[in-house]
Structures are given as structure tokens and as C-alpha cells.
Amino acid sequence: MGVEGCTKCIKYLLFVFNFVFWLAGGVILGVALWLRHDPQTTNLLYLELGDKPAPNTFYVGIYILIAVGAVMMFVGFLGCYGAIQESQCLLGTFFTCLVILFACEVAAGIWGFVNKDQIAKDVKQFYDQALQQAVVDDDANNAKAVVKTFHETLDCCGSSTLTALTTSVLKNNLCPSGSNIISNLFKEDCHKKIDELFSGKLYLIGIAAIVVAVIMIFEMILSMVLCCGIRNSSVY
């Protein structure tokens, strides 16, 4: 006999929630795998800056995305299937996974806060790297897309360390159009904006992390309530 009333409502809420979670995981995994195997991105990964090899931030970032996507799909599936099948075993596993993910998020948050300067440095290096690839090999559309994403997201263009050749390309091709950035190229320094993001705007990342944590706690509660409901309904 299935669950009834409020518990039934929780069952479908958990199903819908985790189906969306599973889909999002699939999208992230797909994009990450495409980035990993796309030849132009591979060029970016093996790019050298001067006599120094490129930072492995991007490489690590792609593998983190693959892991995040896979975990999201797995956890989403557990929640989805566990809810619709009313399986205590699957819901118990789902709950355990959420506890582990919650612990990972807290650990990642602490690590990120402690290492924010290094992360900011790596992000700046990655931006420089993408910019170099976009100028030298202008067929590298991924590199251009990365640069444009930086520019549009952070509302910046270039950095004070640029060469004249890069500046020419930025002014004419890679700066956000229709903005006053081109005339204030070095005032809207992307390196400065990245630093600001990791210091002044850290609270935004914190809020995002708290929102994710609250959703996780909410899902944990729902899965436990549903689990108890299933147990109780099987008693009668």
C-alpha cells in the first residue's frame, strides 16, 4: 500500500525536485565532457605562457565539473527513483549522499575561503591564457568565448599587463560593445575585477553556498519524512 495525504505530496515534491537536479547534472556532465574532448579547448589546456606551462586550473576545473555532473545525476536519480518507488533503501542512500555532499560543501567553503587569493591568481592566469590563445590562434572560438564571458560577466576588458597587440584585438573585437569600457580600457581591469570578486563580492558566493546548503537540508528533511511515512504505511 502506497503513502497517502501529506506524505504523498512530499513524495512527488521530492521526485520533481530531484528530476530537475538529475537533468541539471546531465547538462553539466555533457558540457564538461564536450569541453574535455573539444580540440580547441585541448589547445587551451596545453598552452604555455612564456616558458611556464599553463596553470592546471582549467584542467582541474573540467574534472571537477565532470565529477559534479556525475554526482548530481547519481544523487538526483537516487532521490527520483527512491521517491517514486517508495524505497526506504534508496531514500536512505540518498540521505547519506546528501550528508556527505553537505560535509563536502562545508569543507570546500572553508578551503575556498582560506585559499581565495590563490584561486583568484589562478583565475587571472586562466583569463590571460585564454586571451593569449584568442589572439595568437584566432580560430580558437572556445578561448574567445571564455574571454567574452569574463568581459560580460565582470563588465571588464583586458588588464594593465597587456601588450599593445592584445590591446588592439581587445578594442576592436573582444571588448563588450556599446559600452564605455573601450575608452576606459585599463580602468575596467579584469584582473582588478577578479580580485574584487574574491574579496569584496565574497559574500555573494557565501549566499549562494548557504542557499545550496539550505536546499540540501530541506531535501534531507523531506527524504527522512518520506522514509518515515513509508515505514509507517507499511506497518498498517
Epitope: 612564456g50 586571451l131 590562434d137 584566432d138 580560430d139 601588450t163
Partner: antibody, heavy 123, light 110 residues
Framework: EVQLLESGGGLVQPGGSLRLSCAAS????????MSWVRQVPGKGLEWVSS????????YYADSVKGRFTISRDNSKNTLYLQMNSLRAEDTAVYYC????????????????WGQGTLVTVSS | QSVLTQPPSASGTPGQRVTISCSGS????????VNWYQQLPGTAPKLLIY???NRPSGVPDRFSGSKSGTTASLAISGLRSEDEADYYC??????????FGGGTKLTVLG
């Protein structure tokens, strides 16, 4: 041997058109930015235009903007300069040159030059 | 009128050291690397020095380049008769792109 060979020069009337070609050998044209530079006989060098490896970024000197068009066909290993609305002051030897870009996108000059082709604009 | 200023002429006797200057502004020479070219009579220019002071392979070490502030210099030591040519400095400027100096005609005397 790395070489550039220009062709297409000649005598043309003012207002006329001419298309210069530059064939590359000994290297893959598609891996390099390329430029056209001109020199009035007995005078100094004047940069005309530059084009990036896949034609995404193109630059012109103010004196030729709107009249000249730089292009390339990487499959044919050839660089072009289409010259329209030619004037007497465009009379010069036109050189095509390979642009050298160093680490961290530093412009390291024009490291390979063709022998040049003479364009004479006269009525 | 070039934005990079070179002396129109320079001269020296064989074995002597000759220096050719190239002066610009903070927006071109001051913030970018300079390249030097040699153009022998009746031939195409040849890259002599790139990135302020680097020599391409095949260029004798008698040729050296340096830059200080908004002035670049090309030095030729142990001058030879075959060094008689026109010399040009050049930079990539972010606004006017490839910019050449007016050129210096080097004459080897005697």
C-alpha cells in the same frame, strides 16, 4: 626554405583597381599573422594592413582604410591585397611580410619578407 | 610624419661603433617592445633585432639593441662596408598598429 613571393603589381590609372597576391612556401601560412608594407621608391617604409591567422582580426592604416581589403586563403597558402580607388600617392613597392608573435602576445616584428611588387598609379 | 623619430643619416669608418637612435612617446615606444630592420640597397627589409634586444638566427652579434624609457637604440660595433644600408625601428602601437620610424641611412666612410 621559407619564402614569400608577391605578384599582381603593375601600371594602373587613378581610380582603378589592382589585386596583389603573396604566395607563401616553406611554412604554413595559416599559423601566422600577415602584413602588407609599402615603400615609395627612395622613401621610408609604411605599414598598410595586417590580418590574423584565421582572418578574425584585420587592421588598416588610415591612409588606405575603405579602399584596400586584406584577405587570405590558408588552403592555398596565399595572402591578398585588393586595392580599389587607387591614387597617385599609392605608387610604391608593396611587400608582404610574416608577423612574428612571441610569448605573452608580444609583437616581435616582421620576420619574413617578400621581394616586393611595384604598383604604379599614373594616367 | 612618423611618430617614431630617427636621425636621417649616420656614418662611421670601418671598425668603428655606430649607434642609431629611435625616439617615441610613452604610448608607443615607452610601453611596447621595439624591432629593428636593415634594408640593403635594392633589397627587401630584413628583421635585425626583435623584442628590444634579441637577434634572429643569422644576424651577427655585432648588432645589438636596447631600450630605455621612450628611446631605443641600435648599436653596430666593428662597422663593415656591407653594413651600409637603411635602418628602421618599428613598434606595434595599440592605436595606430604597426608604426615605422622614418629610417636612418648609414654610410660607411673610407
Amino acid at each position: 626554405e621559407v619564402q614569400l613571393l608577391e605578384s599582381g603589381g603593375g601600371l594602373v590609372q587613378p581610380g582603378g583597381s589592382l589585386r596583389l597576391s603573396c604566395a607563401a612556401s616553406g611554412f604554413t601560412l595559416g599559423s601566422y599573422w600577415m602584413s602588407w608594407v609599402r615603400q615609395v621608391p627612395g622613401k621610408g617604409l609604411e605599414w598598410v594592413s595586417s590580418i590574423s591567422s584565421s582572418s578574425s582580426y584585420i587592421y588598416y592604416a588610415d591612409s588606405v582604410k575603405g579602399r584596400f581589403t586584406i584577405s587570405r586563403d590558408n588552403s592555398k597558402n596565399t595572402l591578398y591585397l585588393q586595392m580599389n580607388s587607387l591614387r597617385a600617392e599609392d605608387t610604391a613597392v608593396y611587400y608582404c611580410a610574416r608577423q612574428r608573435i612571441g610569448d605573452l602576445v608580444v609583437h616581435y616584428g616582421l620576420d619574413v619578407w617578400g621581394q616586393g611588387t611595384l604598383v604604379t598609379v599614373s594616367s | 610624419q612618423s611618430v617614431l623619430t630617427q636621425p636621417p643619416s649616420a656614418s662611421g669608418t670601418p671598425g668603428q661603433r655606430v649607434t642609431i637612435s629611435c625616439s617615441g612617446s610613452s604610448s608607443n615606444l615607452g610601453s611596447n617592445t621595439v624591432n629593428w630592420y636593415q634594408q640593403l640597397p635594392g633589397t627587401a627589409p630584413k628583421l635585425l633585432i626583435y623584442g628590444n634586444s634579441n637577434r634572429p638566427s643569422g644576424v651577427p652579434d655585432r648588432f645589438s639593441g636596447s631600450k630605455s624609457g621612450t628611446t631605443a637604440s641600435l648599436a653596430i660595433s666593428g662597422l663593415r662596408s656591407e653594413d651600409e644600408a637603411d635602418y628602421y625601428c618599428e613598434v606595434w602601437d595599440s592605436d595606430s598598429y604597426v608604426t615605422f620610424g622614418g629610417g636612418t641611412k648609414l654610410t660607411v666612410l673610407g
